[in-house]
């Protein structure tokens, strides 16, 4: 058993049929010595008396808010949550496996630049009685500070018969050094509590590996005289690290119709302009990627050919 | 060329070669990116490699103030990785495929280090840790880790030279 926060405790249980469970001793936070009784949740049934209560925690019915009282007055609470371990593996019932970029990916994180700011998100089908708490650091043995905000519900989607809820959190490294080569990864830890179930999820990454620039901005077309060709120009996204002579991007320019199966024109460039062949009913799209490190491409920025 | 005395390097040449190094480092192991090597433990294997750190003057302001600190750090790293790529970690079993870009990568690391420090000038170089894994699978894992680390190192070096070529070239 360990303390998650004040008056909230996590009991770690090996979860299998007829498991013996864990013996837990609760102590009433009071100077009083006698006349103390214990109850669980809203029930008025007295579970025991005395300053301490010893219980055998085996299942969710044994978890919940234990309260010690004296003469009708509440003295203190202890909330017991369960953390299940099945076949040596901690349960992951609360969050959905996003399976990208690999199986057992529950947390996904992205950064728009090298400033040390990043966003993580996760998915669940649970809609109520759900809380999250996020902590982060750079490195684990001698951790350096990363400050995370509160996790918020950022999107709701319907997937078949189910509703899916996306939560996200923004974090910022306290003393980021955008130009340095990272040697210690960022660690992100998410505590998830659904009713009386506790789970924790972790992710470890370098900012450089989660970089995904915003799409290029201000796409403009200029038809070339006596030619089918069009000069397309764009700018670096505002959110990208500066100076651009140092933090450079490379670009992919593509002309394609509405269907992916249609023919296309495609060219890669380090410049912020390119010449392509525009077709009626097609669009010109441009996306960006770090020029020197193969992290994710941005989403496409598009303009119609006409 | 960047000599210890403090003259400027051939920024444009260094830019071209460092960008080539980036391409080679990724083609040497493009799939490394899909392996979470941090899960494999044995941190010490790549903790000894020289990293370009915050105080090394490789940021745009540091380069403007005095690029020598940064260039020396890059030179150290190039020599370090050049020696690693020539060591039995890469020459031992399992043999690299003959078409592996590691050979080109090795030659390009040497080429860039020579551009930075011509014969006859010497910056101090870092000692190579004695990493000689006994098992072929350990060697394979170590190669992946070294290449992954090299990808990050050459990306910073390429940024430095691109910025230098754009803003510091005479």
């Amino acid at each position: 058993i360990w303390e998650l926060k004040k008056d909230v405790y996590v009991v770690e249980l090996d979860w299998y049929p007829d498991a013996p469970g864990e013996m837990v001793v609760l102590t009433c936070d009071t100077p009083e010595e006698d006349g103390i009784t214990w109850t669980l949740d809203q029930s008025s049934e007295v579970l025991g008396s005395g300053k301490t209560l010893t219980i055998q925690v085996k299942e969710f019915g044994d978890a919940g808010q234990y309260t010690c009282h004296k003469g009708g007055e509440v003295l203190s609470h202890s909330l017991l949550l369960l953390h299940k371990k099945e076949d040596g593996i901690w349960s992951t019932d609360i969050l959905k496996d996003q399976k990208e970029p690999k199986n057992k990916t529950f947390l996904r994180c992205e950064a728009k630049n090298y400033s040390g700011r990043f966003t993580c998100w996760w998915l669940t089908t649970i809609s109520t009685d759900l809380t999250f708490s996020v902590k982060s650091s750079r490195g684990s043995s001698d951790p350096q500070g990363v400050t995370c905000g509160a996790a918020t519900l950022s999107a709701e989607r319907v997937r078949g018969d189910n509703k899916e809820y996306e939560y996200s959190v923004e974090c910022q490294e306290d003393s980021a050094c955008p130009a340095a080569e990272e040697s210690l990864p960022i660690e992100v830890m998410v505590d998830a509590v659904h009713k009386l179930k506790y789970e924790n999820y972790t992710s470890s990454f370098f900012i450089r590996d989660i970089i995904k620039p915003d799409p290029p901005k201000n796409l403009q077309l200029k038809p070339l005289k006596n030619s089918r060709q069009v000069e397309v120009s764009w700018e670096y996204p505002d959110t990208w690290s500066t100076p651009h002579s140092y933090f450079s991007l490379t670009f992919c320019v593509q002309v394609q119709g509405k269907s992916k199966r249609e023919k296309k024109d495609r060219v890669f460039t380090d410049k912020t302009s390119a010449t392509v062949i525009c077709r009626k009913n097609a669009s010109i799209s441009v996306r960006a990627q770090d020029r020197y490190y193969s992290s994710s491409w941005s989403e496409w920025a598009s303009v119609p050919c006409s | 060329r960047a000599v210890p005395g403090g003259s400027s390097p051939a920024w444009t040449q260094c830019q071209q070669l460092s960008q080539k190094l980036c391409t080679l480092a990724w083609s040497a192991h493009p799939l490394v990116g899909h392996m979470d090597l941090r899960e494999e433990g044995d941190e010490e294997t790549t903790n000894d490699v020289p990293h370009i750190q915050c105080g090394d003057g490789c940021d745009p302001q540091g380069l403007r103030d005095n690029s020598q600190f940064c260039l020396q750090r890059i030179h150290q790293g190039l020599i370090f990785y050049e020696k690693l790529l020539g060591s039995d970690i890469f020459t031992g079993e399992p043999s690299l495929l003959p078409d592996s870009p590691v050979g080109q990568l090795h030659a390009s690391l040497l080429g860039l280090s020579q551009l930075l420090q011509p014969e006859g000038h010497h910056w101090e170089t870092q000692q190579i840790p004695s990493l000689s894994p006994s098992q072929p699978w350990q060697r394979l894992l170590l190669r992946f880790k070294i290449l992954r680390s090299l990808q990050a190192f050459v990306a910073v070096a390429a940024r430095v030279f691109a910025h230098g070529a754009a803003t510091l070239s005479p």
């Epitope: 060219v267 890669f268 460039t269 | -």
Partner: antibody, heavy 118, light 107 residues
Framework: EVQLVQSGAEVKKPGATVKISCKAS????????LHWVRQRPGKGLEWMGW????????EYAPKFQGRVTITADTSTDTGYLELSSLRSEDTAVYYC???????????WGQGTLVTVSS | DIQMTQSPSSVSASVGDRVTITCRAS??????LHWYQQKPGKAPKLLIK???QSISGVPSRFSGSGSGTDFSLTINSLQPEDFATYYC?????????FGGGTKVEIK
């Protein structure tokens, strides 16, 4: 199977015009760009131009501008290359090539030898 | 026009050898570079697109690398059917241009 089949060899006199064809099969003709590339005896490859059969848009290499016309007939799934004012240096194998991507060549015809000789 | 220069113009090699052909562009072309193989009397065949992207059905012994102005095609463990002429082609800008070719001959 995507295939391009070209018309047979031609012998022409200097100053004449040649028109060679390229019949596509195994795909929707207008879904691919069609290019013409030539290769003079013992020499390298030379790109001449392309057509988008869907709308008839064309682009020619400056070297051939004014002498070359590329057309496409979507009713017969056939592309054509017409080269006028022939000279001996135009003796070459002429290839048609196609791709969904404009700038490189995925599928090639077998080639048509054009000999220009007086 | 962008000039493409291939080297060497010919190379003699044996079955099992590793052969590397280089291609240099007269200006930076990012990764807009493609490689073809041509056998005598036959049409060219696409081997690699965009400098390093493999083509379905092409043996994995063919690999490409490079960006900017310098590119290479490597044939690992040359097979009898690989003796042919190899061309690079830039697609950075029109007109599309090819290298002069590299003939891989039997030693």
């Amino acid at each position: 199977e995507v295939q391009l089949v070209q018309s047979g060899a031609e012998v022409k006199k200097p100053g004449a015009t040649v028109k060679i064809s390229c019949k596509a099969s195994g795909y929707t003709f207008s879904d691919y760009y069609l290019h013409w590339v030539r290769q003079r005896p013992g020499k390298g490859l030379e790109w001449m131009g392309w057509i988008d059969p869907e709308n008839g848009d064309t682009e020619y290499a400056p070297k051939f501008q004014g002498r070359v016309t590329i057309t496409a007939d979507t009713s017969t799934d056939t592309g054509y290359l017409e080269l006028s004012s022939l000279r001996s240096e135009d003796t070459a194998v002429y290839y048609c090539a196609a791709n969904k991507e404009l700038r490189y060549f995925d599928v090639w015809g077998q080639g048509t030898l054009v000999t220009v000789s007086s | 026009d962008i000039q493409m220069t291939q080297s060497p113009s010919s190379v003699s090699a044996s079955v099992g050898d590793r052969v590397t052909i280089t291609c240099r562009a007269s200006q930076s072309i990012s990764i807009n570079l493609h490689w073809y193989q041509q056998k005598p009397g036959k049409a060219p065949k696409l081997l690699i697109k965009f400098a390093s992207q493999s083509i379905s059905g092409v043996p994995s012994r063919f690999s490409g690398s490079g960006s900017g102005t310098d590119f290479s095609l490597t044939i690992n463990s040359l097979q009898p059917e690989d003796f042919a002429t190899y061309y690079c082609q830039q697609s950075n800008s029109f007109p599309l241009t090819f290298g002069g070719g590299t003939k891989v001959e039997i030693k």
